[in-house]
């Protein structure tokens, strides 16, 4: 199994309410195969924000075309940010399995939300 790293370059991102937040994430390898998921928080109560292979996430858009076979950019854009979106977001690589197996997590990016400028 090849060594794989999940890189979240920004430790923190600050966004004004109502704007979009871009959370960056890249992987250093496509192997082992398996999906990327984004979560807010850690542990069993973490919230799924985006799943590469299934689900409907109307406020979340991949930054890069996820259908490219060589895509290793798993950055996402979250629209219409509100104070409720504040928290630390983790980009997590899974290895295929039944169920998929969590392999590597990025270090996390803390999203803070500023008041909407008047």
């Amino acid at each position: 199994e090849e060594e794989l790293q999940v890189i979240q370059p920004e430790k923190s991102v600050s966004v004004a309410a109502g704007e979009s937040a871009t959370l960056n994430c890249t992987a250093t390898s496509l192997i082992p195969v398996g999906p990327i998921q984004w979560f807010r928080g850690v542990g069993p109560g973490r919230e799924l924000i985006y799943h590469q292979k299934e689900g409907h996430f109307p406020r979340v858009t991949p930054v890069s075309d996820p259908t490219k076979r060589n895509n290793m950019d798993f950055s996402i854009r979250i629209s219409n940010i509100t104070p409720a979106d504040a928290g630390t977001y983790y980009c997590v690589k899974f290895r295929k399995g039944s169920p998929d197996v969590e392999l590597k997590s990025g270090a996390g990016t803390e999203l803070s939300v500023r008041a909407k400028p008047s």
Epitope: L30, I31, P32, V33, P35, D65, T67, K96
Partner: antibody
Amino acid sequence: DVQLVDSGGGVVRPGESLRLSCAASGFTFSSYAMSWVRQAPGKGLEWLAGISAGGSDTYYIDSVKGRFTISRDNSKNSLYLQMNSLTAEDTAVYYCARETWNHLFDYWGLGTLVTVSS
Amino acid sequence: ALTQPASVSANPGETVKITCSGGDYYSTYYGWYQQKSPGSAPVTVIHSDDKRPSDIPSRFSGSASGSAATLTITGVRVEDEAVYFCGAYDGRTYINTFGAGTTLTVL
């Protein structure tokens, strides 16, 4: 319902060209990667080419690289395969197929027959 | 190259397993495609190793382990008689490949 309708097949002479089309409906075409797969008489399936959802990235099997070109027009919900310098070995039924998130196939066209004969 | 048996046969109601070998587990996803007659459109019965499309009966299931994938039909029916192709996507090469096909005969 997802529908893929292949067209453009026919009888051509060796060395000639042909352009196949695949009309898609029942899903958001611009969100999915697509592929072409063929089946020669009495033979198995052979993947030929794939294209990312946005159309910027293309992938080919070595045997058709340089002769075949996959393309798409998302405004027309259409996929194409331009085939040049055809030989008798290209005689087959050609299918378009929609890709899953991990580049397998979930829906297939009905197929269009290409016959290369002198 | 993907290797699968040329043919299998079973009586109605029996369980059929078709294996497909040749992929590297860490870089490969498998799918299974049913073709009822030559030149007719294939139908996907399994993708992503074990995912069954919503319109495919629950008697079809898939699994992958090591360098092989398996299609299982539990309680096979006469209408399941077809050629089954395994397919694979390799994340190292970005290439799709298919096995030569397995003819399922329901006696």
